[in-house]
Interface confidence: low
């Protein structure tokens, strides 16, 4: 992950990046919406592999929590919301189907923005 | 992906999100920075899946090529910046061994702020 | 000069565990691949288990041979590699090296002189 | 996996005398992946080539490999009295694999 900090940046939205696994993931959403279970671990050749998922999200600490950095405030209200993207994952669905499925993981954190209709 | 559009709402930095085939990727850059290639297939139970990727990354075409949308610009300079983050493939390294690794994917399209020094 | 001397090696039984140790020096440990190569008792040269450096967050591979039943690990703060051999059979009655991986690719351009295990009844 | 192939298993030869050693491998092995080991008795094995014909650091000219696909030399081209020892050729285009050896000894 670049980080705009070192080169003397700043985000207009703050971020938190882990590394989570399925365990503690449990669910997700998939494609379709439906929630499907995320096994913890995936057969390889050569055994077995923790499944796990790099995420990141809105600083829920952060400056950036009660709206985003920079903002032009006359004509803009704003608010920094977590993003998702889609990562391929062995899980298992409500049918008991264990199969890989693409599922939604928080992937970054982006400022939105609402227009001031009038003052 | 979540769409601000629907709720009347702007991004700071307009996006594009595609799906990107490991033929189209061909290599990848992995955790330790080294460069891999990305397997076109990946082996499961029932056969072989296509690997492919979810990425999203700045719109170079739109509004906010030059600048992002809605800062202050009396105080702020501003870019809009594709940012990455880690996914496993199915990869190869330079000595030939085929592994699953994390590599990095354009996932974002983030605001990055410089400040103005003087007026 | 870069040195590397295993150690652990000895006579156990079939069935039992062993593990061995080689220590590293006069090159930057952590940041290299290393492997373990045997030779048996009068025998050529087999590759047994390779580990990645710090830049490959320390995957180990295993030769068919061995998987389930070695475990390669490394300390990079000791700089030292492990090799964990449970379930021993009589075939694995061999002297084991350890070998620094080249950075190009897995050949070994610099090998201890290796530890005797003996699988033996 | 491959497998490789060392001939003769013994080598007889004179100091002086050139050597020619052989190494057949199963399967053609891309971009000459291939590396040679010396070994004398009771030491470890050393690194001679790799790439099928460079030089590792520190060894003598007299020292030199060749050949792609399946079918690989290593030339020692006077030998010397330290170069009577066991010969290992080894492949890296797939998991490493080693041939049986093919011993240099004084006649």
């Known amino acids: 992950h670049s980080d705009p900090a070192r080169r003397g940046e700043l985000s207009v939205c703050d971020s938190i990046s882990e590394w989570v696994t399925a365990a503690d993931k449990k669910t997700a959403v998939d494609m379709s919406g439906g929630t499907v279970t995320v096994l913890e671990k995936v057969p390889v050749s050569k055994g077995q592999l923790k499944q796990y998922f790099y995420e990141t999200k809105c600083n829920p600490m952060g400056y950036t929590k009660e709206g985003c950095r920079g903002i032009d405030k006359r004509h803009w209200n704003s608010q920094c919301r977590t993003t998702q993207s889609y990562v391929r994952a062995l899980t298992m669905d409500s049918k008991k189907r264990i199969g890989w499925r693409f599922i939604r993981i928080d992937t970054s954190c982006v400022c939105t923005l609402t227009i001031k209709r009038g003052r | 992906h979540s769409d601000p559009a629907r709720r009347g709402e702007l991004s700071v930095c307009d996006s594009i999100s595609e799906w990107v085939t490991a033929a189209d990727k061909k290599t990848a850059v992995d955790m330790s920075g080294g460069t891999v290639t990305v397997l076109e297939k990946v082996p499961v139970s029932k056969g072989q899946l296509k690997q492919y990727f979810y990425e999203t990354k700045c719109n170079p075409m739109g509004y906010t090529k030059e600048g992002c949308r809605g800062i202050d610009k009396r105080h702020w300079n501003s870019q809009c910046r594709t940012t990455q983050s880690y996914v496993r493939a199915l990869t190869m390294d330079s000595k030939k061994r085929i592994g699953w690794r994390f590599i990095r994917i354009d996932t974002s399209c983030v605001c990055t702020l410089t400040i103005k020094r003087g007026r | 000069d870069v040195q590397l001397v295993e150690s652990g090696g000895g006579v156990v039984r079939p069935g039992e565990s062993l593990r061995l140790s080689c220590a590293a020096s006069g090159f930057t440990f952590s940041i290299y691949d290393m492997s373990w190569v045997r030779q048996a008792p009068g025998e050529g040269l087999e590759w047994v288990s390779g580990?990645?450096?710090?830049?490959?967050?320390?995957?180990?591979y295993y030769a068919d041979s061995v998987k389930d039943r070695f475990t390669v690990s490394r300390d990079n703060s000791k700089n030292t590699l492990y090799l964990q051999m449970n379930s021993l059979r009589a075939e694995d009655t061999a002297v084991y090296y350890c070998?620094?991986?080249?950075?190009?690719?897995?050949?070994?351009?610099?090998w201890g002189l290796g530890t005797l295990v003996t699988v033996s009844s | 996996e491959i497998v490789l192939t060392q001939s003769p298993g013994t080598l007889s030869l004179s100091p002086g005398e050139r050597a020619t050693l052989s190494c057949r491998a199963s399967?053609?092995?891309?971009?000459?992946?291939l590396a040679w080991y010396q070994q004398r008795p009771g030491q470890a094995p050393r690194l001679l080539i790799y790439d099928g014909s460079t030089r590792a650091t520190g060894i003598p000219a007299r020292f030199s490999g060749s050949g792609s696909g399946t079918e690989f030399t290593l030339t020692i081209s006077s030998l010397q009295s330290e170069d009577f020892a066991v010969y290992y050729c080894q492949q890296y285009d797939d998991w490493p694999s080693f041939g049986g050896g093919t011993k240099v000894e004084i006649k």
């Open positions: 070998a620094k991986e080249n950075n190009r690719s897995i050949f070994f351009d610099y």
């Open positions: 580990i990645r450096g710090s830049g490959g967050d320390a995957v180990p």
């Open positions: 399967r053609s092995i891309g971009r000459s992946f």
